[in-house]
């Protein structure tokens, strides 16, 4: 069973798999940044394991991170935002793993938000449109987005058109007539920044007119 | 073996201008911050500037801010400090440094700039 | 701004032991690493000690960092002098994105 022992014997610690994931978002909370990591097996005994992080700080060594539930957290003013950091899994003062990374490297975006569709009838188009927290950030300011669409009923059948504006045009041609369709977006770090893609946007769901018999338009 | 050669130094009357380059091999330049730092005759080590491993953050010293330029091309490995109006307390020997996982882990062999009229 | 402030010079007999001290002129030392360089003449500096007290492989173990939080100073420590430890030494902290330097110890193995 994975976890250490409760005697202080580090033996059994040592034998499990310590390996974990982080990411950082900057500029989060007004100027603090945060650091988010966990295990990556889920089965861990993380009762007495903590997250610490040294080096590439303003003014301090090391910090350790809060643990909520199953994930390690940190919001700080404090990264140097150069250089490597070095982010250890420690039972007491033993460190168990450690990895030293750059945390402009693994900046996971907040995720897009009032995303939007309105049809114009006689541009016979729909143009997507949607917001991100980025454009005030001072760092991470040029993102690449993805937006996914499919129509309901086409469980997997996503559509993906990468775009680094904040609003895109659909034409009405390319989607079916009087079906529902479903929309979202994420983003990613597209400059300077290197990292992960944000979570998904709320879904936002709209309807395509029916075919005007007359004109083979839709409505 | 990890090297970085510096270039570009020499004799320069003051108000001049020069550029110094630092070709950087056996290690992952895209992966490290870069620094340049100096050293006048028979003096101690002065830092000049460093820049990220993807040229968005870069710092100065104070006395060099607004002259000095520090950029780099990940693509060449080569890192790039160009020097606009030269003082006579410019003169030194320029080393470039590579920070990886911790400062001055390497050091170039530096390039003399002297600024006289 | 801190300053960091290094004794001008230090000499010690072969086999012995000398201690430089670097002091930090305001916050505390404890707050940002502290790393050690050492300059041979006509050479470029090499990293003896980086985060106080880590040796790069390839350094010898008679060379050894720590940080005195009461005096608020780092010191390199040489066991074991030899000739060829003659030179200049340089300490090195961090103020927030800049890099300071202490100004410099000489070195002088006793003949």
């Known amino acids: 069973e994975s976890g250490y022992a409760q005697n202080g014997d580090l033996e059994d610690a040592e034998l499990d798999d310590y390996s974990f994931s982080c990411y950082s978002q900057l500029e989060v909370n007004g100027s603090q940044h945060s650091l988010t990591c966990a295990f990556e097996d889920p089965d861990v005994n993380i009762t007495n394991l903590e997250f610490e992080i040294c080096g590439a700080l303003v003014e301090v060594k090391c910090l350790n991170f809060r643990k909520l539930q199953e994930i390690y957290f940190i919001e700080t003013k404090k990264f140097l935002l150069i250089g490597k950091s070095n982010i250890c899994v420690k039972v007491g003062e033993k460190s168990l793993t450690c990895k030293k990374i750059d945390l402009t490297t693994i900046v996971k975006p907040e995720a897009p938000f009032d995303l939007s569709v309105v049809y114009r009838e006689g541009a016979n188009d729909f143009v997507v449109t949607f917001n991100t927290s980025h454009l005030q950030k001072k760092y991470v300011k040029v993102l690449m987005h993805d937006v996914a669409y499919r129509q309901e009923k086409d469980e997997n059948k996503w559509t993906h058109v990468n775009l680094s504006s904040t609003k895109l045009t659909l034409l009405q041609r390319k989607l079916q007539p009087a079906a529902m369709y479903e929309i979202k977006v994420r983003s990613i770090p597209d400059h300077y920044f290197k990292g992960f893609w944000s979570e998904w946007s709320p879904s936002y769901y709209f309807r395509t007119p029916e075919i005007n018999n007359s004109s083979g338009e839709m409505d | 073996e990890v090297q970085l050669v510096e270039s570009g130094g020499g004799l320069v009357k003051p108000g001049g201008s020069l550029r110094l380059s630092c070709a950087a091999s056996g290690f992952t330049f895209d992966d490290s911050v870069m620094h340049w730092v100096r050293q006048a005759p028979g003096k101690g080590l002065e830092w000049v500037s460093l820049?990220?491993?993807?040229?968005?953050?870069?710092y100065y010293a104070d006395s060099v801010k607004g002259r000095f330029t520090i950029s780099r091309d990940n693509a060449k490995n080569s890192l790039y400090l160009q020097m606009n109006s030269l003082r006579a307390e410019d003169t030194a020997v320029y080393y470039c440094?590579?920070?990886?996982?911790?400062?001055?882990?390497?050091w170039g062999q530096g390039t003399l700039v002297t600024v006289s009229s | 701004n801190f300053m960091l402030t290094q004794p001008h010079s230090v000499s010690e007999s072969p086999g012995k032991t000398v201690t430089i001290s670097c002091t930090r002129s305001?916050?505390?030392?404890?707050?940002?690493?502290v790393q050690w360089y050492q300059q041979r003449p006509g050479s470029s500096p090499t990293t003896v000690i980086y985060?106080?007290?880590?040796?790069p492989s390839g350094v010898p173990d008679r060379f050894s960092g720590s940080i005195d939080s009461s005096s608020n100073s780092a010191s390199l420590t040489i066991s074991g002098l030899k000739t060829e430890d003659e030179a200049d030494y340089y300490c090195q902290s961090y103020d927030f994105h800049h890099l300071v330097f202490g100004g410099g110890t000489k070195l002088t193995v006793l003949q």
């Open positions: 440094a590579r920070q990886g996982d911790y400062m001055g882990n390497n």
């Open positions: 820049v990220g491993w993807d040229g968005f953050f870069t």
């Open positions: 305001s916050g505390s030392i404890d707050s940002s690493y």
């Open positions: 985060e106080d007290d880590q040796r």
